[in-house]
């Protein structure tokens, strides 16, 4: 009966050697792909000279296989019923799933110029930077290959800076041969309702990026949730990509390869301004760009990116306020394509299918002292790329799931 199923589930979702959950948790059996769309700037000169709207054209997908490496340094702590680990990063380009090669060129914002002018607002330092920018023949925009843009290149302007500074720049630099964590999560041995919930990240229960409760590390890493998920639940999870905890709410029942799953989505409320959703007040960290915290749909994560002016949003500024996208032409937000969802099998709490979508933007501001930014008359939150990270349970795994879990219940 149900009691037997519950007992089996409780045993098998514990994160310890020998359980079904543990085997799949150490190294996911699902193939995960990360698709990138790059925003190619069509009118760099007009923007730089006349402060025109930036015209972008998305190009993609460029697809990489990710999260194929097993968790490392897995250590059980029987004292507090936790297991700690590192999640290694790796990306392998998939030409057959891409529209071009890693050598394709794109016109994008000059990351170093935009970041340096933000990190060093002092006018004297900016005058110095300006002379180096001019000397290196750098400009507001640059042409870079996909490989350079994503994984890193040596910047000619930063190479001239006469004091210690990292000269390598890239949207995801460094990535390969790095790891996310250390994560310490509850293994569920003492209480199955805590399984996979993060206890600490990098040795702390807080992030030190936000004020108040916004700084908390809540929930799991979204790969799984404690079992017996209810539709009424708000599922909390932490995403290191966006340097914050966030949540998903039930949207609909979905049949995934014969398995009944619950589709949970990130609601627009999660991206709202504090005016619309007071709970978000502590995610507003500055008053000027956010127009006194009335803008919505973009998250300033500069504190998490060594001061670089990185803003996270949904693709094409979905769920963002009009003022955010009014300086950009060529965006077409679409809920179906650009929102994030998780398909969760409710009995086990396993995420059997997901689509994580996010956009990485960089703020660029006028600078009286930096020639290539001098003619700008307004701030721009410039979209650089958006990504769609997806994973779906394989046919074999789905068959096993149907027979061992859902089949037994039905």
């Amino acid at each position: 009966g149900d009691m037997l199923i519950q007992k089996t589930i409780k045993k098998e979702v514990v994160l310890e050697e020998g359980t079904i959950a543990f085997k799949n948790w150490v190294k996911t059996g699902t193939e995960i792909y990360r698709q990138f769309w790059i925003f190619d700037v069509q009118n760099p000169q007009e923007v730089m000279m006349n402060s025109s709207n930036i015209q972008v054209k998305q190009r993609g997908p460029y697809t990489y296989r990710v999260r194929f490496l097993a968790k490392e340094n897995i250590t059980q702590d029987p004292k507090d019923n936790t297991v700690s680990f590192l999640q290694p990063n790796g990306a392998i380009f998939e030409p057959s799933l891409s529209v071009g090669t890693e050598a394709d060129n794109f016109t994008v914002l000059n990351l170093a110029v935009a970041a340096a002018s933000h990190i060093y607002p002092n006018p004297f330092v900016q005058v110095v930077l300006n002379s180096l920018i001019n000397k290196s023949k750098s400009s507001m925009f640059q042409v870079r290959t996909l490989r350079e843009l994503l994984w890193g290149y040596t910047d000619p302007f930063l190479s001239l800076v006469p004091y210690p500074v990292s000269t390598r720049v890239g949207m995801f630099y460094p990535y390969n041969n790095t790891a996310d964590g250390v994560y310490k999560v509850f293994n569920g041995k003492d209480s199955i309702s805590k399984v996979a919930i993060i206890d600490t990240y990098k040795g702390k229960r807080n992030l030190s990026y936000w004020e108040s409760y916004c700084d908390m590390i809540n929930g799991t890493d979204a790969a799984s949730f404690p079992p017996f998920v209810e539709k009424s639940q708000v599922l909390q999870f932490f995403s290191s990509d966006i340097c914050r905890s966030i949540y998903a709410v039930f949207e609909s029942d979905v049949n995934l390869k014969g398995i009944p799953v619950y589709r949970f989505v990130l609601p627009s409320k999660a991206f709202a301004s504090p005016v619309q959703n007071p709970d978000n007040h502590c995610f507003c960290t500055e008053k000027i760009i956010s127009k006194n915290c009335t803008s919505y749909g973009v998250l300033d994560i500069s504190k998490c990116k060594e001061g670089k002016p990185v803003y996270i949003s949904l693709p094409h500024f979905l769920y963002a306020s009009p003022d955010v996208s009014e300086t950009i032409d060529g965006l077409n937000p679409n809920e179906e394509e650009h929102r994030t969802y998780l398909d969760i099998e409710p009995i086990t709490g396993f995420t059997l299918q997901f689509a994580k979508r996010l956009q990485v933007n960089l703020l660029v501001k006028p600078s009286n002292k930096i020639q290539v930014l001098k003619r700008l008359k307004r701030n721009y939150i410039v979209p650089i790329l958006w990504l769609n990270e997806t994973g779906t349970i394989g046919d074999e795994k789905a068959k096993m799931f149907r027979s061992q879990v859902t089949g037994k219940i039905n």
Epitope: Y120, P121, N122, P123, V127, V128, S131, P162, Y163, N368
Partner: antibody
Framework: QVQMKESGAELVRPGASVKLSCKAL????????IQWVKQTPVHGLEWIGG????????VYNQKFKGKATLTADKSSSTAYMELSSLTSEDSAVYYC?????????????WGQGSLVTVSA | ETTVTQSPASLSMAIGEKVTIRCITS??????MNWYQQKPGEPPKLLIS???TLRPGVPSRFSSSGYGTDFVFTIENMLSEDVADYYC?????????FGSGTKLEIK
């Protein structure tokens, strides 16, 4: 209030070196650049270079590269300028100055000046 | 390097008269011009900073105008305490460069 206290007058022999100091008072040393200016009756005011203790950024007027070396000691909130291989051309009043910050005010605060006389 | 040409080199004016000093730059510097007053035995004092901005505590008889390459500094009603040397400084690009100075005396 903001003050820039410079070292006293120096009489030095040709070919020798001299190190001038500038102690910053009344503000956070690492937040603002310190720049050095030379004044002579013949050439008037000339900008030598500047140092931003917070970012370790140093920049020189090409004309004074090799002549002046700028350093800063955060622990004592003091900036230094060393002048080497001195000749009579280097006889001048040297000022250290601080900007007004983010409001476009350059050389808003000045030291009293250090008179350097190069003579055999 | 941006050169700054200041004129006149000296100026003898009566009390109450209007004083005009001009600086011309060899490159376009927007409005990144600053003006200083130096009295004998003292360091220069910033009167007007970039964007023709009068510094706090500086009397309103001092003003400046200009954009690009041509800049004018004005004392509306000269007082005896205004006797000094006056310098302009371009702060648009490196190296920063000063004008050669204008000596203002009483007629």
């Amino acid at each position: 209030q903001v003050q820039m206290k410079e070292s006293g007058a120096e009489l030095v022999r040709p070919g020798a070196s001299v190190k001038l100091s500038c102690k910053a008072l009344g503000y956070t040393f690492t937040d603002y650049e310190i720049q050095w200016v030379k004044q002579t009756p013949v050439h008037g005011l000339e900008w030598i270079g500047g140092i931003h203790p917070g970012s370790s950024g140093i920049v020189y007027n090409q004309k004074f590269k090799g002549k002046a070396t700028l350093t800063a000691d955060k622990s004592s909130s003091t900036a230094y300028m060393e002048l080497s291989s001195l000749t009579s051309e280097d006889s001048a009043v040297y000022y250290c100055t601080r900007g007004g910050g983010y409001d476009g005010a350059w050389f808003a605060y000045w030291g009293q000046g250090s008179l350097v006389t190069v003579s055999a | 390097e941006t050169t700054v040409t200041q004129s006149p080199a000296s100026l003898s004016m009566a009390i109450g008269e209007k004083v005009t000093i001009r600086c011309i730059t060899s490159t376009d510097i927007d409005d990144d011009m600053n003006w200083y007053q130096q009295k004998p035995g003292e360091p220069p004092k910033l009167l007007i900073s970039e964007g023709n901005t009068l510094r706090p505590g500086v009397p309103s008889r001092f003003s400046s105008s200009g954009y690009g390459t041509d800049f004018v500094f004005t004392i509306e009603n000269m007082l005896s305490e205004d006797v000094a040397d006056y310098y302009c400084l371009q702060s648009d690009n490196l190296p920063f460069t000063f004008g050669s100075g204008t000596k203002l005396e009483i007629k």
